[in-house]
């Protein structure tokens, strides 16, 4: 199921910035999603559950995000996404076991002079 | 116990490079230790155990390392450690449960002209 996750639109554009969507299987209950810009961790979101199914979200890098039951979307301004960077969604699954780490979708994003002019996407296997 | 781990010498110097020590509690049996250079993951080491207490080590970034029952030391050459970078040890504890993630010690390291001249350490709480 994890291998199917690359077949989605990773980048979408809104005023002044970029939304980067990182999909994961709906069966995953507890996870960490990291967004890499080249080798740098740009965003880091961890969702865990307490004994009463209460949900805890940790977002130490304070990235604007949106979380659903099968995706995490991070919102970047153009400064974060310029210079033709390679972005990668990296998923750690805590629950259900076993613990797994997967590099999901990845793509190049090129923005010139704050105009969203070109987008070249390369999907990782 | 995790809060006591900052009270150790994080950096030590040897010919041509730096040893960065990331301490963890002796009670931790299965773990992942990541070394961050600023926001970049420089090293990533995972230790898990089999049924007969055999140990499996995964080191996908092929960092030279030394592992004991309470620390992981990564060996970097000066190229990796130059330009006044901030280094951080990040620990994920798998065993004993429950799963935890902790940022351990962190410190700035400044190296000029391959001479180990100054070291300013800032310990994170």
């Amino acid at each position: 199921e994890l291998n199917d996750l690359a077949n989605h639109r990773m980048f979408s554009f809104h005023d002044g910035g970029v939304q980067i969507s990182c999909n994961y299987p709906e069966t995953v209950q507890q996870l960490k999603m990291q967004l890499f810009k080249d080798r740098e961790v740009l965003c880091d979101l961890t969702k865990t559950k307490g004994s009463g199914n209460t949900v805890s979200i940790k977002n130490p890098m304070s990235c604007p995000y949106q979380l659903s039951n099968n995706s995490v979307s991070f919102f970047l301004d153009n400064a974060d996404s310029s210079q033709g960077s390679y972005f990668l969604c990296s998923l750690s699954i805590f629950d259900p076991p076993p613990f797994q780490e997967k590099n999901l979708s990845g793509g190049y994003l090129l923005i010139y002079e704050s105009q969203l002019c070109c987008q070249l996407k390369l999907w990782l296997p | 116990e995790l809060n006591d781990l900052a009270n150790h010498r994080m950096f030590s110097f040897h010919d041509g490079g730096v040893q960065i020590s990331c301490n963890y509690p002796e009670t931790v049996q299965q773990l992942k230790m990541q070394l961050f250079k600023d926001r970049e993951v420089l090293c990533d080491l995972t230790k898990t155990k089999g049924s007969g207490n055999t140990v499996s080590i995964k080191n996908p970034m092929s960092c030279p390392y030394q592992l004991s029952n309470n620390s992981v030391s990564f060996f970097l050459d000066n190229a990796d450690s130059s330009q006044g970078s901030y280094f951080l040890c990040s620990l994920s504890i798998f065993d004993p449960p429950p799963f935890q993630e902790k940022n351990l010690s962190g410190g700035y390291l400044l190296i000029y002209e391959s001479q180990l001249c100054c070291q300013l350490k800032l310990w994170l709480p």
Epitope: D95, P96, P97 | T48, S51, G52, S56, F94
Partner: antibody
């Protein structure tokens, strides 16, 4: 849906051999340590042995009661676990369960419904 | 091999009663102890792992405590559906089960 289905049980004479299979589906079989546990009629649970994952070189470990007579193997490409039982004794009569366990980062296991092995002359 | 003992071997209690089972290991197993429930004709079900952590979907009336060699399993308020045999299991070194405790209703 997670499933572990044991097969291969039946009646065998003392000194004979039998091979049990356990077909797994619905989870990542190759990531789990696979155990065999047995239960003699009206008795308690008894651990038989385990085979670890590829990361641990498929290491096997056995209880003293079966060591040297039983062999556990696995085929990750077929999602199947095996138990080869040789030199069977009457006291090996039991329901044999295969179980899949993992301990990182949560202890977790799946059990099959078991297959009955009867050793009798 | 690590040996596990359990007591009592059986008990009868009323609905709503607090039920306690003890388990002892022949050597220090730290907290690597789990508890299973088995109903007649069924496979065992994991209730508790690492001495006191509840497995997913297990009601909070079940609890565990202890460390080292001495462990306790408690049902705070016995329900009719709790009629079963309960086993402790060490997983510090391979696996060993206790002999079981059969719980029924008075």
């Amino acid at each position: 849906e997670v499933q572990l289905v044991e097969s291969g049980g039946g009646l065998v004479k003392p000194g004979g051999s039998l091979r049990l299979s356990c077909a797994a589906s619905g989870f990542t079989f190759s990531d789990y340590f696979m155990h065999w546990v047995r239960q003699a009629p009206g008795k308690g649970l008894e651990w038989v042995g385990v085979i670890d994952t590829k990361s641990f070189n498929y290491a096997t470990y056995y209880s003293d009661l079966v060591k040297g007579r039983f062999t556990i193997s696995r085929d990750d490409s077929k999602n199947t676990l095996y138990l080869q039982m040789n030199s069977l004794k009457t006291e090996d009569t039991a329901v044999y369960y295969c179980t899949a366990t993992i301990a990182v980062p949560y202890y977790f296991d799946y059990w099959g419904q078991g297959t009955l092995v009867t050793v009798s002359s | 091999d690590i040996q596990m003992t359990q007591s009592p071997s059986s008990l009868s209690a009323s609905v709503g009663d607090r039920v306690t089972i003890t388990c002892q290991a022949s050597q220090d197993i730290s907290n690597y102890l789990s508890w299973y429930q088995q109903k007649p004709g069924k496979a065992p079900k994991l209730l508790i792992y690492y001495t006191n952590l509840l497995a997913e979907g297990v009601p909070s009336r079940f609890s565990g405590s202890g460390s080292g060699t001495d462990f306790t399993f408690t049902i705070s308020s016995l329900q009719p559906e709790d009629i079963a045999t309960y086993y402790c299991q060490q997983y510090y070194n391979y696996r060993t089960f206790g002999p079981g405790t059969k719980v029924d209703i008075k």
